[in-house]
Amino acid sequence: RPSPTLPEQDALPSSEDDDDDDDSSSEEKETDNTKPNPVAPYWTSPEKMEKKLHAVPAAKTVKFKCPSSGTPNPTLRWLKNGKEFKPDHRIGGYKVRYATWSIIMDSVVPSDKGNYTCIVENEYGSINHTYQLDVVERSPHRPILQAGLPANKTVALGSNVEFMCKVYSDPQPHIQWLKHIEVNGSKIGPDNLPYVQILKHSGINSSDAEVLTLFNVTEAQSGEYVCKVSNYIGEANQSAWLTVTRPALEERPAVMTSPLYLEHHHHHH
């Protein structure tokens, strides 16, 4: 792959970077005086970017990579929580390895928690990818959920839907999928806790408790779905909304709702 062009030097660390760019020239080699075909940036190893949540003990090193290519050579820059990330924003700074499309932060501390976004761009396009960093106390610790999951979904009537919840936990977590429901027209019980229905939980024939799949959805299944994860240290939960739409010119189909795992109970959320 081509080596990326170095952006402004303010992103470079003070320490040297031996593996920075070992190409003799970053210019395109032209043999026939024709310009190479432009290519917008693209990920060269997307499978190495699938792990978005990184829960790391204090003092360790974090390396985030966004291996990319494009023509002309794309530039690489990093944001923290959506804002420009400069070395003086953290004690010890950071290193950007342009040859390996990576950022390295040594000796992480709790204030390093946040979302780190790589932006790879050339004049023909821009791509970005966000990693979530949590600096944790070593195990045991509370469960940690990847930000943005589960994600809101809008689907057509009769579709299948998949919600995902990415969990980092030691000790072993207990995962529950809940749906807020109404009982006798009320969403809140007499004890002021919301009514929920348990759709799935780890330990009850759940091959993959981090994923909730709903088949042939009905309008009645619209609503808020909650991924609740707990261990003996604590708990965490995140929710998403399902909106089920139906074609405007189609009559409402007569379908019976059949919950996956019917158990009405009060649950604090």
């Epitope: 003990p57 003092a59 360790k60 090193t61 990579k65 040594d106 106390e137 070593r138």
Partner: antibody, heavy 116, light 108 residues
Framework: QVQLQESGPGLVKPSGTLSLTCAVS?????????WSWVRQPPGKGLEWIGE???????SYNPSLKSRVTISVDKSKNQFSLKLSSVTAADTAVYYC?????????WGQGTLVTVSS | SYVLTQPPSVSVAPGQTARITCGGN??????VHWYQQKPGQAPVLVVY???DRPSGIPERFSGSNSGNTATLTISRVEAGDEADYYC???????????FGGGTKLTVL
Amino acid sequence: QVQLQESGPGLVKPSGTLSLTCAVSGGSISSNNWWSWVRQPPGKGLEWIGEIYHSGSTSYNPSLKSRVTISVDKSKNQFSLKLSSVTAADTAVYYCARATDWFDLWGQGTLVTVSS
Amino acid sequence: SYVLTQPPSVSVAPGQTARITCGGNNIGSESVHWYQQKPGQAPVLVVYDDSDRPSGIPERFSGSNSGNTATLTISRVEAGDEADYYCQVWDSTSDHRVFGGGTKLTVL
């Protein structure tokens, strides 16, 4: 400058408990570091045993976890290793070390022999 | 658990370049550190974070890390470089530190 010094018995009987202490001088054990133990059997390679943070949080090598306890004494600026149910296979030079992601400072090492 | 594989020995003539490899599954995603150990002495860090050198380590020592292999390169090898060399990572998946088996560098 920070220095590390291991101390403890050089001879331990089989089935007994190996106990070593590492004194940290010239710096605070409450810094943002992990305080580790690494061993090296005669003529063999390095083996990470485990480590502790000043908060008391620990991590151990899975192969030794059932026998290892690492503790920290902030008032004395030192940390300790206990390895129970030792056998001749535990004979090694034991190093204490300071670490972040890597080990940047090592003690000189102490040879512990397990023998009756 | 994560495994790091090093060649048991590497031989090189003085003035030549020695390359010591450290193999591991997708090791390029980890930060690799290298230590030199001479007989009867504690290990000394020679490269950290794949390619950085601590102060006092000669420029002849360099490192790289990509894919499934990290490499320690010693250029213009001297007799005093004869030692055992170990690679090490903190495996972020298991939250454990791992050493390679070590490579004995012999200067011919």
